[in-house]
Amino acid sequence: KFSKQSWGLENEALIVRCPRQGKPSYTVDWYYSQTNKSIPTQERNRVFASGQLLKFLPAAVADSGIYTCIVRSPTFNRTGYANVTIYKKQSDCNVPDYLMYSTVSGSEKNSKIYCPTIDLYNWTAPLEWFKNCQALQGSRYRAHKSFLVIDNVMTEDAGDYTCKFIHNENGANYSVTATRSFTVKDEQGFSLFPVIGAPAQNEIKEVEIGKNANLTCSACFGKGTQFLAAVLWQLNGTKITDFGEPRIQQEEGQNQSFSNGLACLDMVLRIADVKEEDLLLQYDCLALNLHGLRRHTVRLSRKNPIDHHS
């Protein structure tokens, strides 16, 4: 399925690109999937379509939903879906996992942190950068074009980095923020922090009601002795053993170590006889060691039994 997850904060600009690509000369029509209502192209609207792009200037929580884009050429149509979620601004400093873009790793030699999605926006330098909500100060930090460079990277530089910039549309300015985690690699080039390879962050797993389903939480841990290295599942923030649902169990899967000292662990979550209420739960894959904790969240969605394309 040509579907893409996009997210943003209320009262900020959000620009989404159609997951189906086409030549610039092709027309692209956008619809709000729930109502099949066409998205206008006039720029005076708060939400409008501009070719491959769908613009929320600014975004509102009520804009959340699935948007359909149809790329039309003289010989074919291609359909894509943008799953947009707009969240309320957090009052505290914490950036929740669901607002995080992909984690990047750096080492002493290479420590660029790119500002996610910035290429979609009409912005001008300089970018503002924050670490764990604190504005970055000091000569070690250099904002350059669309990325941050950190000189003489240390383990303590790991954390959540937020870029803030202004999008300009017809003379009006809109704020945009985006956050991603930065991890510091060891000399072998692998993160000292746990790295989760599966599931993907915010993955939607399709399941059939009444059938069994398996979810695998798989992570690798950096070189060296791992006194504490664990991979586990949580349901709605609760350990499986404490959740008290006998249909849902976790068991250790494949463990493997590699020639560079990397150790990887799997934990399989088995759900027997999937029920409707299972779709309402939040499934968290957790990987932790002495350097920190990583969490990837999965949700289940109902698979149409006759849908053989997914």
Epitope: S102, T103, G189, V195, G197, A198, A200, T216, S218, C220, G253, Q254, Q256, F258, L262, C264, D266
Partner: nanobody, 118 residues
Framework: ESGGGSVQAGGSLRLSCAAS????????MGWFRQTPGKGREGVAS???????IYGNFVKGRFTISEDNAKNTLYLQMNSLKPEDTAMYYC?????????????????WGQGTQVTVSS
């Protein structure tokens, strides 16, 4: 995949895996092997940065490489042992975070059989 077959212990084989239909700048490709009744075991992986990782059992005998122009992944296997006998699979994922762990991979080839006799 192609390049599998039968070989005497100590011999060599080169496996190839031709990928089509992807144009991703960030990716991870891997080789895995499976013997009857056992799970898939990670042999080697390579990502879009060229970083390689090998299973502990490889011990310098195998080399993973790619030819970007041909969209082809290779596994050069030297000093083969009878215990290397297995079905070998190539796999891919659209992310440069990379390790040869089967659960990380989305796209799988059909497999090619390698048999090493003593």
């Amino acid at each position: 995949e192609s390049g599998g077959g039968s070989v005497q212990a100590g011999g060599s084989l080169r496996l190839s895996c031709a990928a089509s239909g992807y144009t991703y700048s960030r990716y991870c490709m891997g080789w895995f092997r499976q013997t009857p009744g056992k799970g898939r075991e990670g042999v080697a992986s390579i990502n879009s940065d060229g970083t390689t990782i090998y299973g502990n059992f490889v011990k310098g005998r195998f080399t993973i490489s790619e030819d970007n122009a041909k969209n082809t992944l290779y596994l050069q296997m030297n000093s083969l042992k009878p215990e290397d006998t297995a079905m070998y699979y190539c796999a891919a994922r659209v992310d440069s975070t990379c390790a040869p762990m089967p659960s990380w991979f989305t796209y799988w080839g059909q497999g090619t059989q390698v048999t090493v006799s003593s």
